[in-house]
Structures are given as C-alpha cells and as structure tokens.
C-alpha cells in the first residue's frame, strides 16, 4: 500500500512573487486527518516552508503568519506561496502524511521547481 504524490515539475512565479501549484495524492487508506507540508530543497539542505493539517472535507488552514495558503478538494490540495523573491528560486517538495486513524502513511512528491524573477524597478518619470 504505497501513497503516491504528484505535483508539477515546473512553475513560474508571478511578477508579484506568487506561485501556485496542485499537490495530488493517492490515498491507500481512509484517512480523516491529513497533514500537508511544503519543503524547500536547495544544495541538499531541506527546510520547512509551511505546513497545515486538515480534516477530510474541511478547509486547509495554515498559521496566520504563514507565507502559504491553500484549499483542498478530496485528495487534491491547491497550494499558493506568496512573498517570493528571486533568491527563493528552488525545488519545493509536497509532503503528505495520513495522520489519523493509524496506520500512518507517508507520501513525498518529486518537487516543483519554482522560478522567481524579481520585477525590474520602474524607471523614474519626469
């Protein structure tokens, strides 16, 4: 019983530093509680970007100070990361954990390469 997680290979952030992608998982069990974590991998270092736990059928809620927002629909999570700068370009991995009821299942996507280009400053107008 494996849990497969799918996410797009590449996403380009908007000029306002916003990137959205879908994280979809094939659940091997009937989970009622799911945790979704976005991890960033750069130079073999992995850091947590944001995480949210949700009850199936309910909305996904990140912490108030999180740079992520999202919505869930069945086994699909729509994730949005805000406030991105060029230096945040990297591989963003979607991790899905079936938390309850036991047994626990882990699923990790291959990662979405998010490219962020800082906008050119507007030229001074006379």
């Amino acid at each position: 019983k494996a849990m497969h997680v799918a996410q797009p290979a590449v996403v380009l952030a908007s000029s306002r530093g916003i990137a959205s992608f879908v994280c979809e998982y094939a659940s091997p069990g009937k989970a009622t509680e799911v945790r979704v974590t976005v991890l960033r991998q750069a130079d073999s270092q992995v850091t947590e970007v944001c995480a949210a736990t949700y009850m199936m059928g309910n909305e996904l809620t990140f912490l108030d100070d999180s740079i992520c927002t999202g919505t869930s629909s069945g086994n699909q999570v729509n994730l949005t990361i805000q406030g991105l700068r060029a230096m945040d370009t990297g591989l963003y991995i979607c991790k899905v954990e079936l938390m309850y009821p036991p047994p626990y299942y882990l699923g990790i996507g291959n990662g979405t390469q998010i490219y962020v280009i800082d906008p050119e400053p507007c030229p001074d107008s006379d």
């Epitope: 494996a2 849990m3 736990t53 991790k95 036991p102 626990y104 882990l106 699923g107 990790i108």
Partner: antibody, heavy 119, light 108 residues
C-alpha cells in the same frame, strides 16, 4: 546544534511504572515527529512509539499498546514515555529520536537511558 | 507490518575491502522510504542513508545506498577502521516503522 537528552531510566520491579523524559534543544520542536526506539541487551533496534507535531496523533508498536503512553510538551521542548505494567521483556536502552523532515527516519538520537525490569 | 530481513548476519572483511549489505522487505517499501543506520558498541545509532540512496549530513561518500521495491543494498566502497560496526535498515513508508535485525561488519 540538535541535542536530545533522555532521563528517568533505572531498575523497576515487574508490574510497576516508570516515566522517561527527553529534553530537546537546537531545533523547532513542534515541527517534528518524535519517537522512542528501544534496544534490549545484545539485541537489535525496535521502534516503540511516535507522537506527531502538536501531540494529538500517536502510534505504537503492538508489543507495547495499552501499556505505554507517549506524550509531549511543546512549550517545554520535552518528550515523555509513560511505561505501566512493566515486564522483564521491557528491559532495554530507550532512545529518544527525532523524525526527519522528509519522513520518519531518525536523523538525531539521544544517548539512551537504561530501563531494567527485575524483581 | 513490513518485515525486513538483512544478510549476511555477519560480514568479516579487512580494511580497504568493499562491503555489500543486503536488506529485503516482505512487501514493497513505498517510494524507497528506507534508511540505513550504523551503530557502534555503547553508542546510539547514526543515520547514514535515507530515501534508499540519499546520504545524511556529514556521511562520507564511501557509503552509498541503492535499491527499490523489496531489495535494498548498502555499499561501503573501502572499509575504514571506524566502519566496523553493526548496520540496520529501517522502513518508514507506513507504521509500524520496522528495523531489520542488523548486519555485523567485523575485522577478518
């Protein structure tokens, strides 16, 4: 740097109780699943229990279900293992271990605390 | 429950030789969620490999992991004196998380 320090081990009679503690430092405690793994003298490693993130969800090995309770206090960065109705076969070194960001492998371990169940 | 079997039980080799350790699962380990640990007497285990092939921080490149499904391998390309120890595999794709019985690598 990440540090895990267990305490609370000792010699206890069969049927009695014991509580182990693990003080964590050097990382954001609430972002990680925390585990107890034990090793009987001269034997291999056995996963005992996990407690996830905010402490609401837990899972146990069949060999300890109903006798052992895992808990955590995120405000104190501390993990606990309450062991009841102890048996001779619970004699082991108990390790506290941190789960990895990319899954529940164990990337940091404490030094272990020895629990001996004997009359 | 996924049962892990390790072979051989003991591997007797000399420093400089190549060590090949096997870990076999009773059912497929999803997405290669398999880790390897090294343990020396009187010490806690140390993570070597996760995700079947990713080296943990600070682990020398003489250690490498491979495999998928039910068959996994830990290779130590050239044994150093400090590599003589017991090695355990562990699956973490689903609970209960299970360890293999270990392979002892000792000096010939």
């Amino acid at each position: 740097q990440v540090q895990l320090v267990e305490s609370g081990g000792g010699v206890v009679q069969p049927g009695r109780s014991l509580r182990l503690s693990c003080a964590a430092s050097g990382f954001t405690f609430s972002s990680y699943g925390m585990h107890w793994v034990r090793q009987a003298p001269g034997k291999g490693l056995e996963w005992v229990a996990v407690i996830w993130y905010d402490g609401r969800n837990k899972d146990y090995a069949d060999s300890v279900k109903g006798r052992i309770t895992i808990s955590r206090d995120n405000s104190k960065n501390t993990l606990y293992l309450q062991m009841n109705s102890l048996r001779a076969e619970d004699t082991a070194v108990y390790y506290c271990a941190r789960g990895g960001l990319l899954g529940p492998y164990f990337d940091y371990w404490g030094q272990g605390t020895l629990v001996t169940v004997s009359s | 429950e996924i049962v892990l079997t390790q072979s051989p039980g003991t591997l007797s080799l000399s420093p400089g030789e190549r060590a090949t350790l096997s870990c076999r699962a009773s059912q497929s380990v999803s997405s290669s969620y398999l880790a390897w640990y090294q343990q020396k007497p009187g010490q806690a285990p140390r993570l070597l490999i996760y995700g079947a092939s990713s080296r943990a921080t600070g682990i020398p490149d003489r250690f490498s992991g491979s495999g998928s499904g039910t068959d996994f391998t830990l290779t130590i390309s050239r044994l150093e004196p400090e590599d003589f120890a017991v090695y355990y595999c562990q699956q973490y794709g689903s609970s209960p998380f299970t360890f293999g019985p270990g392979t002892k690598v000792d000096i010939k």
